[in-house]
């Protein structure tokens, strides 16, 4: 994993400007881990970043991710009067100019370098789950969440009508 200590320094300059025409309502620098306390880490390999899910050694420093929160109307057409309410969208940036992207064709989660305005594939609906966990649902593909598969992040289709264990789409955010 590479160090991301520089994140704090560029945070303000990077995110003061608007993204998709609006500014984030708030930002949060946090480490990302799975429900089972494995760390999400980012490594530079062959000039591109890879994302890993791994157990860190006791004193190994966790990588940080900058979460930028945005307000959004729910895209559902179930209620024309807007009663479905506003929700929170989030973008995740582990290092300058790179954001997590949903690759729906490959069912993968990738780090892409991109300029603003960010594409829809970089936005995820934040779900507030129990046990102080969150889930991230693809803006571009409702019902598809960031999850853990074979020690990597992947896109996982979740059907609310199915009875299955969802621990693999639960994540913890921590400032430490």
């Amino acid at each position: 994993a590479f160090g991301i200590s520089g994140v704090q320094k560029y945070t303000r300059a990077l995110h003061d400007s608007s993204i998709t025409g609006i500014s984030p309502i708030t930002e949060y620098l946090a480490s990302l881990s799975t429900y089972n306390d494995q760390s999400i880490t980012f490594a530079l390999e062959d000039e591109s970043y890879e994302i890993y899910v791994e157990d860190l050694k006791k004193d190994e420093k966790k990588d940080k991710v900058l979460l930028s929160y945005y307000e959004s109307q729910h895209p559902s057409n179930e209620s024309g009067d807007g009663v479905d309410g506003k929700m929170l969208m989030v973008t995740l940036s582990p290092t300058k100019d790179f954001w997590l992207h949903a690759n729906n064709k490959e069912h993968s989660v990738e780090l892409h370098k991109c300029e603003k305005p960010l594409p829809d594939q970089a936005f995820f609906v934040l779900h507030n789950m129990h046990s102080n966990c969150v889930s991230f649902e693809c803006k571009t593909d409702p019902g598809v969440f960031i999850g853990v598969k074979d020690n990597h992040l992947a896109l996982i289709k979740v059907d609310s009508s199915e009875n299955l264990c969802t621990e693999n789409i639960l994540f913890k955010l921590s400032e430490t």
């Epitope: 559902s76 179930e78 479905d84 309410g85 929700m87 507030n128 102080n132 059907d159 609310s160 009508s161």
Partner: antibody, heavy 121, light 111 residues
């Protein structure tokens, strides 16, 4: 139109039981966490119970004051959430609101009109 | 449990004037870098209606005169210019931890 309609309220003696129902319409019921919130006459709001989704194993949570006496459940095929209330006490007298949390689960944004439960001998 | 305390219990404000309601939590309601604090309005004989979520974001269709602020344990709901239709009881609620707890309510009337 998004709607929640409660039923099953009424007069019951202390120690008795009652089952409240809440029929949902106008949205995909199985996608939303459901809650019950009550309001005693002339008093404030008190959250009672919550049930999550099938893929969350329908996990449930309760206020301490009703734990062990009240049970929340749902039937997604009928678009209905229930509140089974046992060992009722005079202090359970209240209007009981069925409520839906928003998509993402940060707040309640759809409420029923409420059903009155009166516990008295 | 997180205890939510509102002040004042009641408030009389002239039409067009500013109304301010405070809410204090017994412990921080912050998580994930946000404050999980909501404000609801309840008119007589009606269910509550969401005004503000995560401390400062307006609910859908809520007039701009309603705004929220604060973080951690101290929060404020402001009605910038009170209208006759704003007469109601206002509740804060934390949705950080179960049990989700409400403040005791603040009754807003016209002076």
């Amino acid at each position: 139109e998004v709607q929640l309609v409660e039923s099953g309220g009424g007069l019951v003696q202390p120690g008795g039981s009652l089952r409240l129902s809440c029929a949902a319409s106008g949205f995909t019921f199985s996608n939303y966490w459901m809650n019950w919130v009550r309001q005693a006459p002339g008093k404030g709001l008190e959250w009672m119970a919550e049930i999550t989704l099938k893929f969350n194993n329908y996990s449930t949570h309760y206020a301490e004051s009703v734990k062990g006496r009240f049970t929340i459940s749902r039937d997604d095929s009928k678009n209905t959430v229930y509140l089974q209330m046992n060992s009722l006490r005079a202090e359970d007298t209240a209007v009981y609101y069925c409520a839906r949390r928003n998509y993402g689960n940060y707040y309640i944004n759809v409420w029923g009109q409420g059903t009155l439960v009166t516990v008295s001998s | 449990d997180i205890v939510m305390t509102q002040s004042p219990d009641s408030l009389a404000v002239s039409l067009g004037e500013r109304a301010t309601i405070n809410c204090r939590a017994s412990e921080s309601v912050d998580k994930f870098g946000m404050s999980f604090l909501n404000w609801y309005q309840q008119k007589p004989g009606q269910p509550p209606k969401l005004l503000i979520f995560v401390a400062s974001s307006q609910g859908s269709g809520v007039p701009d005169r309603f705004s929220g602020s604060g973080s951690g344990t101290d929060f404020t709901l402001t009605i910038s210019s009170l209208q006759a239709e704003d007469v109601a009881v206002y509740y804060c609620q934390q949705s950080k931890d179960i049990p989700y707890t409400f403040g005791q309510g603040t009754k807003v009337e016209i002076k």
